[in-house]
């Protein structure tokens, strides 16, 4: 039994890190393998993660971590019974995939303006809280070509757009994702999408 693709890990910079790897053949990850992880430099216990299958030869492990901070660094040991298959390290703060924003809401009652709001996925005392920026994706359910991205580069989790920039009388969906440029994170997953019917009063033509 050998590791074909070494584990790669990402952290949500809160409490969960996810490691994925591939074995050289079909493997029952949960019965045959264990991923041990322990903080370097600190007094802390070693923890064991039981991996799950992720395709025939792929394995994935969700490592529970106690409130990740920037200096934390983990040793990782992948075992098959008594055999050490791979040894490595992982610094969560250098491999961050933020949590997806939540509670995306479209407010349509603001005088022909659409107000989209969502929640920052981090508590105020987390380092990422003040550093997330967002991308909002809006698309038409009727017209696949009507697909647009708005970059929200300020910290406030909201976006205002004129309803008239979208077509009237049809349904739209929106979703939002986050990243933190100054910490070189990847993008989060998209939030669940929300749907609304776009309608606005056409301005009277002046003659």
């Amino acid at each position: 039994m050998k590791v074909l693709q070494e584990p790669t890990c990402v952290s949500d910079y809160m409490s969960i890190s996810t490691c994925e790897w591939k074995m050289n053949g079909p493997t029952n990850c949960s019965t045959e393998l264990r991923l041990l992880y322990q903080l370097v430099f600190l007094l802390s216990e070693a923890h064991t993660c039981i991996p799950e299958n992720n395709g025939g030869a792929g394995c994935v492990c969700h490592l529970l971590m106690d409130d990740v901070v920037s200096a934390d660094n983990y040793t990782l040991d992948l075992w098959a019974g008594q055999q050490l298959l791979w040894k490595g390290s992982f610094k969560p703060s250098e491999h961050v995939k933020p949590r997806a924003p939540g509670n995306l809401t479209v407010h349509t009652n603001v005088s022909d303006t659409l107000l989209l709001t969502w929640s920052n996925p981090y508590p105020p005392d987390n380092y990422l809280y003040n550093h997330l920026t967002y991308a909002v994706n809006i698309w038409s359910e009727n017209d696949p070509a009507d697909f647009r991205i708005y970059n929200v580069t300020y910290l406030e989790p909201s976006l205002r757009i004129a309803a008239s920039t979208l077509k009237s009388g049809i349904s739209y969906r929106a979703r939002v994702r986050a990243w933190a440029q100054c910490y070189n994170t990847t993008w989060s997953e998209w939030s669940p999408s929300t749907k609304w019917h776009n309608s606005y009063r056409e301005p009277f033509e002046q003659h």
């Epitope: 106690d66 250098e94 987390n126 100054c182």
Partner: antibody, heavy 117, light 107 residues
């Protein structure tokens, strides 16, 4: 409002022991990392220990590892530092600090520990 | 260990001056840097964290910038209460370390 008050400092002989306390009000210590940071007279700052909110992660600087022990009493909302085998170079003002992402956002006024024969 | 070098060690300035203090890290620390102010006989006070984020209640004349190995603390218009010693701290890796301090004195 947030307040941290250290006590337990004083004069001790080399090789002796002291237990510092930090009484906290205005927040619950079990919700926060808590740290001890020291400053030798006329010198800079040295971060010597922290304990994570769950208590499962404890940090010690190499200079105090094996001699100092950080602990806390959540019921009393207090932080402690047990200092054994004290040396002259441990002479310093000892501060406790509420710690947010490894940054001290609220500090006590400090307590002076003097190690001398 | 990551060493932090502050420059200058001492700085004489007048009320109203723009003051800049630099902190160099011996290796890259992303934006994991904080700045503190300490007055004689008092505990340090947090000014800035995450290299540039102002701590709540700190006057807006204080600002921080930089990432990687070079960071600056700027006081846009020095006030009488700003004469103190300023320390940087890295929280990128253990052991957690501080710079040697910059003392800002009245000219």
């Amino acid at each position: 409002q947030v307040q941290l008050v250290e006590s337990g400092g004083g004069l001790v002989q080399p090789g002796g022991s002291l237990r510092l306390s930090c009484a906290v009000s205005g927040f619950t210590i079990s919700d926060h990392y808590m740290s001890w940071i020291r400053q030798a007279p006329g010198k800079g700052l040295e971060w010597i220990s922290y304990i994570s909110s769950s208590g499962s992660k404890i940090y010690y600087a190499d200079s105090v590892k094996g001699r100092f022990t950080i602990s806390r009493d959540n019921a009393k909302n207090s932080l402690f530092l047990q200092m054994n085998s004290l040396r002259a170079e441990d002479t310093a003002v000892y501060y406790c600090a509420r710690t947010r992402q490894l940054v001290g956002d609220y500090w006590g006024q400090g307590t002076l520990v003097t190690v001398s024969s | 260990d990551i060493q932090l070098t502050q420059s200058p060690s001492f700085l004489s300035a007048s009320v109203g001056d723009r003051v800049t203090i630099t902190c160099w890290a011996s290796q890259g620390i992303s934006s994991y840097l904080a700045w503190y102010q300490q007055k004689p006989g008092k505990a340090p006070k947090l000014l800035i964290f995450a290299a540039s984020t102002l701590q709540s209640g700190v006057p807006s004349r204080f600002s921080g910038s930089g990432s990687g190995t070079e960071f600056t603390l700027t006081i846009s218009s020095l006030q009488p209460e700003d004469f103190a010693t300023y320390y940087c701290q890295q929280l990128n890796s253990y052991p957690l370390t501080f710079g040697g301090g910059t003392k800002v004195e009245i000219r």
